[in-house]
Interface confidence: medium
């Protein structure tokens, strides 16, 4: 939190949150456990909805410990599922390009450029 | 940046009703569990209510100081938080926040005064 | 039930060092808090969460002189070299979800003033 609500929101805290609590299915107690579920389905549905991929890319799951790394494999899960590009049934569309980090098969834009932008966008 | 911004404080008789909102931006706000918080003048804080996401069914909690009294709610397609208040009590006033899902991010506040 | 207790009152002089002490209900002695700030005729402010282990992670733009540490039931706040806009109220704040019900509590707070 900053001096001021103006200077209040930079992507630091969210990042923190995310990499801590996202997919963390290890708390040590129920007041950890409805943080991480809130914080799993937020990121899911927000990477789901505004085709985003983390706070700042698809690079926050590779260069930064988490939760997530911890639960998954770096092979099969180099970013999580929400990150790769959907059909209309909501599956990845090529899970394997997805997956290899194929341009067009996976969301190389980060959530906060999004979230943060014009203050009418939701 | 986030902002929450509440509106709809004011004077209201006892048992009399109302309703507060808080209009939500630099979120994306239908992803979020959202809270009301009070505060009464010169006391702690309280927490009120919390409203969950569509994903988890809009599920609905409320201390027992307000239940079967207030009612929270929130319209996603506008980015707004309510919270209806009836059978207002004295022992209501306070100033209402709109805080959000881990209680990270609070609004200004907005008033309630219940007197006769 | 869920309780989080807090001295109501402290002083310290400008420079100085301050802990400030949040005590969880004994069977909830492992359970992570908040700690806020709120100054007079403002919101609170996120100021860290502060786990059972002592690790915390602090708001964006808190000073680093913030920092906190746990020990048992008990959660600490310390601020060193205290400043003129470190006076406020502190208050602790712990979450608990069981059983689809939830509550989230808060402490009576901590009148920090700065001599």
């Known amino acids: 939190t900053a001096a001021t609500q103006q200077d209040f929101f930079t992507p630091n805290l969210f990042l923190k949150q995310m990499l801590e609590r996202y997919q963390n299915n290890s708390p040590p107690n129920n007041d950890d456990q409805w943080k991480n579920n809130g914080v799993t389905k937020t990121w899911d549905r927000l990477m789901l909805q505004d085709n985003c991929c983390g706070v700042n890319g698809p690079s926050d799951w590779q260069k930064y410990t988490s939760a997530f790394r911890t639960e998954n494999n770096d092979a099969d899960y180099p970013w999580p599922r929400q990150c790769c590009v959907m059909n209309n049934l909501k599956e990845p569309l090529n899970l394997e390009a997805c997956k290899l980090g194929v341009p067009g098969f996976y969301h190389n834009q980060g959530c906060y450029e999004l979230i943060s932008g014009p203050m009418n966008r939701h | 940046e986030v902002q929450l911004v509440e509106t709809g404080g004011g004077l209201v008789q006892p048992k009399g009703s109302l309703k507060l909102s808080c209009a939500a931006s630099g979120l994306s706000f239908n992803t979020y569990a959202m809270n009301w918080v009070r505060q009464a003048p010169g006391k702690g804080l309280e927490w009120v209510a919390r409203i969950r996401s569509k994903s988890n069914n809009y599920a609905t909690y409320y201390a027992d100081s307000v239940k079967d009294r207030f009612t929270i709610s929130r319209d996603d397609s506008q980015s707004m938080l309510y919270l209806q208040m009836n059978n207002l009590k004295t022992e209501d006033t306070a100033m209402y926040y709109c805080?959000?899902?881990?209680?990270?991010?609070w609004g200004q506040g907005t008033t309630l005064t219940v007197s006769s | 039930q869920l309780v989080v207790t807090q001295s109501s009152s402290a002083s310290f002089s400008l420079g100085a060092s301050a802990k400030l002490t949040c005590t969880l209900s004994?069977?909830?002695?492992?359970?992570?808090i908040e700690w806020y700030q709120q100054q007079p005729l403002k919101p609170p402010k996120y100021v860290m969460e502060?786990?059972?282990?002592?690790?915390?992670s602090t708001g964006d733009g808190i000073p680093d002189r913030f920092s906190g540490s746990s020990s048992g039931a008990d959660r600490y706040l310390s601020i060193s070299n205290m400043q003129p806009e470190d006076e406020a109220i502190y208050i602790c704040?712990?979450?608990?979800?069981?059983?689809?019900?939830?509550?989230?509590?808060f402490g009576g707070g901590t009148k920090v003033t700065v001599l």
């Open positions: 502060l786990k059972k282990d002592g690790s915390h």
């Open positions: 704040g712990v979450g608990e979800a069981i059983k689809e019900q939830f509550v989230y509590v």
């Open positions: 805080v959000t899902s881990l209680f990270d991010y």
């Open positions: 004994s069977q909830h002695s492992t359970y992570t």
